[in-house]
């Protein structure tokens, strides 16, 4: 959480953001609040990216001023123009690029002052794994597939009979570029598994964590997934 | 005034490809996305990807991945979609649709004429 | 992915008020949809008539609207006109594709 304060002049406003991680090709959110004021007309919301000439985007007097935006941003930037006069300046953004990664100001003047707030933007690729039995091969084996992930990730399994124990030399991962030439569809297979357990497959790198879990019995199989970003700090 | 204006009909043979164009007059073309649209009868609008002409940016449904690409050339303010590998699943009517992102405006507002394919042996 | 559902078919009368609705398998409709509603009227005529839920594209007449009605998108046409009769689409966004509605077929009587 990074909290940022005004210049000098007009008082000081508290503007707060929260470092996020965008997902490339789909849509994204970079988080910026700040105290309201009571006129939408007296709100300014500015935001910019470190080394980038032009504005990402601004939205003043109740509507988008992009006469001064990058090139970069045109077309995929909106803030939640409903939400602004309650002190939401987040920005959306639209078909999130690799090349989007960065720091990010979020800029703020209001009637009661002004105010900013500093935001770090990763971007990769990540997906939710799915865990099958595969039928086709000759011993009980598990495959792991995830469609989506950048960089490049790591993939580790576990049980939860065989707690500790270490699956690399019974697993086999393979990562395939996917017709992008950037994002990777992760497939590992795991070997000679037992029945009445439950395994585990995480996929992480430095943007995201996500777990495949499969619980497979005599008389039926159980999956459960979830993923979660990393490094969700605000400031 | 806003205007999309696309290539005319299309008679192909299966196996081909073709390129349909779409050419935007009235507005700034390169801040505007350009959303591709298939018509079937029977099975209503399927949207094919869209593209951002200013940067290139592009995004496909999954479905259409291997079928279309999008170009556009921002001299001449035309989008283009090619489909390779034609049969006859892909005889429909083809639409390009201007998007407007922004705060306080998304929205469709304006579709071309439409461009007719037929694939046929 | 989603499948978007919308009535086959309604009827109404000229100056009447009718609501067209637009339901996602996914569950309820939200801002981030950013529903859009189009027309289609005879030999491919299309025109953007809603975005964004509750976005009117300048040109589009006043009786047209857009809200969020429960956990569907909807379209309202307050004093229905008889050259309303089309078929009505909706779309919704998915984070990083679009998905339509099978189309309402508005009859005017």
């Known amino acids: 959480l990074i909290i940022g304060f005004g210049i000098s002049g007009r008082h000081s406003i508290t503007v707060t953001t929260v470092a996020s991680a965008g997902n490339i090709g789909e849509d994204g959110i970079l988080s910026c609040t700040f105290e309201p004021d009571i006129k939408l007309s007296d709100i300014v919301i500015q935001w910019l990216k470190e080394g980038v000439l032009g504005l990402v985007h601004e939205f003043k007097e109740g509507k988008d001023e992009l006469s001064e935006q990058d090139e970069m941003f045109r077309g995929r930037t909106a803030v939640f123009a409903d939400q602004v006069i309650v002190g939401n300046a987040s920005l959306r953004l639209k078909n999130v690029q690799l090349t989007d990664a960065g720091t990010y100001k979020c800029y703020i003047i209001t009637s009661k002052g002004k105010g900013n707030a500093n935001l770090e933007y990763k971007t990769g690729a990540f997906s939710m794994p799915e865990v099958n039995v595969d039928y086709n091969a000759s011993s009980e084996t598990l495959r792991c597939e995830a469609p989506r992930w950048f960089p490049q990730p790591t993939v580790v399994w576990a049980s939860q009979v065989d707690q500790g124990a270490n699956f690399s030399e019974v697993s086999n991962t393979s990562f395939e570029l996917n017709s992008e030439n950037v994002t990777m569809k992760v497939v590992s297979v795991l070997y000679n598994v037992t029945i009445n357990n439950t395994y585990s497959c995480m996929i992480e790198n430095d943007i995201a964590k996500a777990t495949g879990d499969i619980k497979v019995t005599e008389s039926e199989i159980k999956r459960r997934s979830h993923l979660q970003l990393l490094n969700s700090k605000a400031s | 005034q806003v205007q999309l204006q696309q290539s005319g009909a299309e008679l192909m043979k299966p196996g081909a490809s073709v390129k349909i164009s779409c050419k935007a007059t009235?507005?700034?073309?390169?801040?505007?996305?350009i959303e591709w649209v298939k018509q079937r009868p029977g099975h209503g609008l399927e949207w094919i990807g869209e593209?951002?002409?200013?940067?290139?940016?592009?995004k496909y449904n999954e479905k259409f991945k291997t079928k279309a690409t999008f170009t556009a050339d921002t001299s001449s303010n035309t989008a283009y979609m090619q489909l390779s590998s034609l049969t006859s699943e892909d005889s429909a009517v083809y639409y390009c649709?201007?998007?407007?992102?922004?705060?306080?405006?998304?929205?469709?507002?304006?579709w071309g004429q439409g461009t007719t394919l037929t694939v046929s042996s | 992915q989603a499948v978007v559902t919308q009535e086959s078919a309604l009827t109404t009368s000229p100056g009447e008020t009718v609501t067209l609705t637009c339901r996602s398998s996914?569950?309820?409709?939200?801002?981030?949809?950013?529903a859009n509603w189009v027309q289609e009227k005879p030999d491919h005529l299309f025109t953007g008539l809603i975005g964004?839920?509750?976005n009117r594209p300048p040109g589009v007449p006043a009786r047209f609207s857009g809200s969020l009605i429960g956990d569907k998108a909807a379209l309202t046409i307050t004093g229905t006109q008889t050259e309303d009769e089309a078929i009505y689409f909706c779309?919704?966004?998915?984070?990083?594709?679009?998905?339509f509605g099978g189309g309402t077929k508005l009859t005017v009587l």
């Open positions: 649709a201007r998007y407007y992102f922004g705060s306080v405006n998304f929205y469709f507002d304006c």
């Open positions: 009235g507005y700034t073309f390169s801040s505007y996305w």
């Open positions: 593209i951002l002409p200013g940067s290139g940016i592009t």
């Open positions: 996914t569950g309820a409709v939200t801002t981030s949809n950013y």
């Open positions: 964004g839920t509750d």
């Open positions: 779309a919704l966004w998915y984070s990083n594709h679009w998905v």
